[in-house]
Structures are given as C-alpha cells and as structure tokens.
C-alpha cells in the first residue's frame, strides 16, 4: 500500500481542516488508514482522524480543531496499521479556504432596486469575520449567456443593483462566495443559490 498523491489540506480558519490524498489502488480508507495530527506546541497530544472514501483510491479526512491562530503548525502522520505511509506538516493560516456564506436572500420589494443580503459565515470573534470580501454571481435560467459577477469589496454582506440591469419578466438565480485577501485564501465554495422572478416597470418611452 502506497500513497500516490500526498495529502493536501485546507483550513476553514475556524474548526475544521480538510485533507485529501490518493492511494495507489482501491482502498477502504476508514478501515485501513488513520491520519494522526498534532499541534506543534508544548504538551499537545496527537489526535486521530478517520478518513472517508473520496472515489476509488481517494481519501478525505476532516480534522477537528478547537480554533486556529496564525502561529499554528501541525504535524501529520498517515498510518496503515503499524506502517507509516507519509509524514508531513500543515500550517492552517497558509492554506485557508473560507466557509461559504449562507442565507442568501433577494429582496425585491425595494422600488426598482434588488437588494441581495447574505450572512458572514464566521462569528465576530474570528479573525476572518472582518476580512472577507465577496463575489456575487447572478445568471438567467433562460439565457446561459446572461451571466454576471459582482465583486463586493466592502465588508457589509449585501449588494444593491438596479433591477433594470437585468431583463424583466424572467427568472434569475444568485449565489455568493467569499475570500480573504489578508491570508491570500482560495475562494470558498458557492453558497446555495436562490431564485427570484425579475419584474420592474419599464419607463414610458417619450416620442
């Protein structure tokens, strides 16, 4: 049994780090493998993650952490029984993938304006809470070419757009994702999408 693709890990900078790797053949990850992780810190102890299958030869492990601070560094040991298959380290602050925003809502009752709001996925005491910026994706269900991205570079989790920038009388969907420049993170996954029917009064044409 050998590791084909070494584990790579990302942290949500809150309570979970996710590590993925590939073995050289079909593997029952949960019965054959264990990933041990230990914070490099005085008196810390090793903790065990039981991996799950992620495709035939792929494994994924969700490492539970109490919290994360920038100085944290973990040792990782991948075991198959008594055999050490791989040894490495992981610094969560250098491999951050934020949590996806939630509760995306489209408010259509504001005159001729669409107000999109969503929730910051972090609690106020988390460092990323005040460092997230967002991308909002809006697209038409009827027209694949009608696809747009709005970058939200301010901290407030909301976006206002004129309803007239979208076509009237058709359905649109929106989703939002987040990233944090301070830790040069990857983008989060997209939030679940939300759907609304766009309708607004066209201004009278004057001749």
């Amino acid at each position: 049994m050998k590791v084909l693709q070494e584990p790579t890990c990302v942290s949500d900078y809150m309570s979970i780090s996710t590590c993925e790797w590939k073995m050289n053949g079909p593997t029952n990850c949960s019965t054959e493998l264990r990933l041990l992780y230990q914070l490099v810190f005085l008196l810390s102890e090793a903790h065990t993650c039981i991996p799950e299958n992620n495709g035939g030869a792929g494994c994924v492990c969700h490492l539970l952490m109490d919290d994360v601070v920038s100085a944290d560094n973990y040792t990782l040991d991948l075991w198959a029984g008594q055999q050490l298959l791989w040894k490495g380290s992981f610094k969560p602050s250098e491999h951050v993938k934020p949590r996806a925003p939630g509760n995306l809502t489209v408010h259509t009752n504001v005159s001729d304006t669409l107000l999109l709001t969503w929730s910051n996925p972090y609690p106020p005491d988390n460092y990323l809470y005040n460092h997230l910026t967002y991308a909002v994706n809006i697209w038409s269900e009827n027209d694949p070419a009608d696809f747009r991205i709005y970058n939200v570079t301010y901290l407030e989790p909301s976006l206002r757009i004129a309803a007239s920038t979208l076509k009237s009388g058709i359905s649109y969907r929106a989703r939002v994702r987040a990233w944090a420049q301070c830790y040069n993170t990857t983008w989060s996954e997209w939030s679940p999408s939300t759907k609304w029917h766009n309708s607004y009064r066209e201004p009278f044409e004057q001749h």
Epitope: Y37, L39, F41, L42, L43, S44, E45, A46, H47, L64, M65, D66, D67, V69, S70, A71, D72, Y127
Partner: antibody, heavy 125, light 112 residues
Framework: EVQLVESGGGLEQPGGSLRLSCAGS????????MTWVRQAPGKGLEWVSS????????YYADSVKGRFTISRDNSKNTLYLQMNSLRAEDTAVYYC??????????????????WGQGTTVTVSS | DIVMTQSPLSLPVTPGEPASISCRSS???????????LDWYLQKSGQSPQLLIY???NRASGVPDRFSGSGSGTDFTLKISRVEAEDVGFYYC?????????FGQGTKLEIK
C-alpha cells in the same frame, strides 16, 4: 472540590531514591497535564517536570534530566516523580500542580491553577 | 532558557495604596493573537503558591478584582489597585510557553 495531595517526601542520603506521589480529585485527571515545581529552603520557585494528560509527552529541567522520571496512572488519578541519584541540591519542598487541558487539539491553558500542599525532600548524609 | 527578571525585588506598601510589579522576559511570550504565556503567582508565608493571573491578563477564579495583569511580548505588569494586609507575600511571574518553565526571582510585598 479540586484538590491535589502530595506524599512520599522524607530524608534520604545522597545517591538514594525517593518516589513522590500526587493524588488528584475533583477534576477529570486524565484530561490535564501535570507539573512538578520545587522550592529549595529560602529560595524561589523552580520548575522540575511536566507530563501531558495521556502521559505521552514528558519534559524535564536540565538539573534533573536522566535522574528523575515523571509518570502518571490515570486509572488511579495519581502523578508520580521517581527521584534517583539524589543530590544535596535536590533538597526542597516539592509541589505538584494542575497544568493545561491537553485532551483538546490545542492545549488550553488556565495557568497552574491548583497546587498541592507540598512534600519535603531532604537529601543529607 | 528564557530568563525572567522581576522588579522591584522588595516592595513596601501602605495599606490602601496601589502597588505595581514588573516582569521582563528575555524572549517574547506571545504565541499568537493575544496568547501571552505569562502568569502571576502569590506565595504567602508557609503556604503553597496560588495563581493570580494567567495568560498575562486573565484573573484566576476567586482572585479579587483589585489584582490586574497587563502587557504583551516581553514586558508585563501586575497591579494591585489598593493593597490590603492579606496581600503580603512573594509574587512570582512565570512563563510557560517553552520548557523549561521559568520563574522570576520573586518580589517581596510587605506592609509599611
């Protein structure tokens, strides 16, 4: 009530051995690291040794390394300090103290928040 | 090893007056984002040490609010807003970020 009670101190000749015990109660003993600190007569406090909750990690002061062994029996809620090759400079009151919570991924530190009453070790010929 | 230096070593105080003890470490005790591994202990005559402050500024359970800790990195201070007769004893700072844990020399607080 959270409590630590040391025992095992006494008078011993140089080169001799003693085993100190520290019985913990009122808290989940296995979840916490434990520490030994000593105080020579008329002197300040000196750290001696620490051990993690499971006993997998042990640390020693240079002055006792190779002579003292820290251990614990979590089934008995008891911490030990085996002291061999004793020297006159080991004469001190020995305290055990409750250290950080090591059952968590990040050891959570509340200070050495509970101390035993101390046990006196005298090394003299 | 990290060297902890306390000052003053002797502190005569009038009851009701404030008192301040300084502790300086030879290396930073800041692990990350507010985790300064510096404690303050009081040892009264004939007793075991007792925890006053942990992680530089957190008051231990049951410690009167006249005791406060501050500082970060290498410079720390213990303040007693109004000294009472029962506060006499030796005050020690201790770092626990690295082994060996190291203590300051101790400050003897006495009543004038």
């Amino acid at each position: 009530e959270v409590q630590l009670v040391e025992s095992g101190g006494g008078l011993e000749q140089p080169g001799g051995s003693l085993r100190l015990s520290c019985a913990g109660s009122g808290f989940t003993f296995r979840d916490y690291a434990m520490t030994w600190v000593r105080q020579a007569p008329g002197k300040g406090l000196e750290w001696v040794s620490s051990i993690s909750g499971s006993g997998s990690n042990k640390y020693y002061a240079d002055s006792v390394k190779g002579r003292f062994t820290i251990s614990r029996d979590n089934s008995k809620n008891t911490l030990y300090l085996q002291m061999n090759s004793l020297r006159a400079e080991d004469t001190a009151v020995y305290y055990c103290a409750k250290d950080r919570l090591t059952s968590r991924v990040r050891p959570y530190y509340y200070g050495l928040d509970v101390w035993g009453q101390g046990t006196t070790v005298t090394v003299s010929s | 090893d990290i060297v902890m230096t306390q000052s003053p070593l002797s502190l005569p105080v009038t009851p009701g007056e404030p008192a301040s003890i300084s502790c300086r470490s030879s290396q930073s005790l800041l692990y990350s984002q507010g985790y300064n591994y510096l404690d303050w202990y009081l040892q009264k005559s004939g007793q075991s040490p007792q925890l006053l402050i942990y992680l530089a500024s957190n008051r231990a359970s049951g410690v009167p609010d006249r005791f406060s800790g501050s500082g970060s990195g290498t410079d720390f201070t213990l303040k007693i807003s109004r000294v009472e007769a029962e506060d006499v004893g030796f005050y020690y700072c201790m770092q626990s970020l690295f082994t060996p844990y190291t203590f300051g020399q101790g400050t003897k607080l006495e009543i004038k």
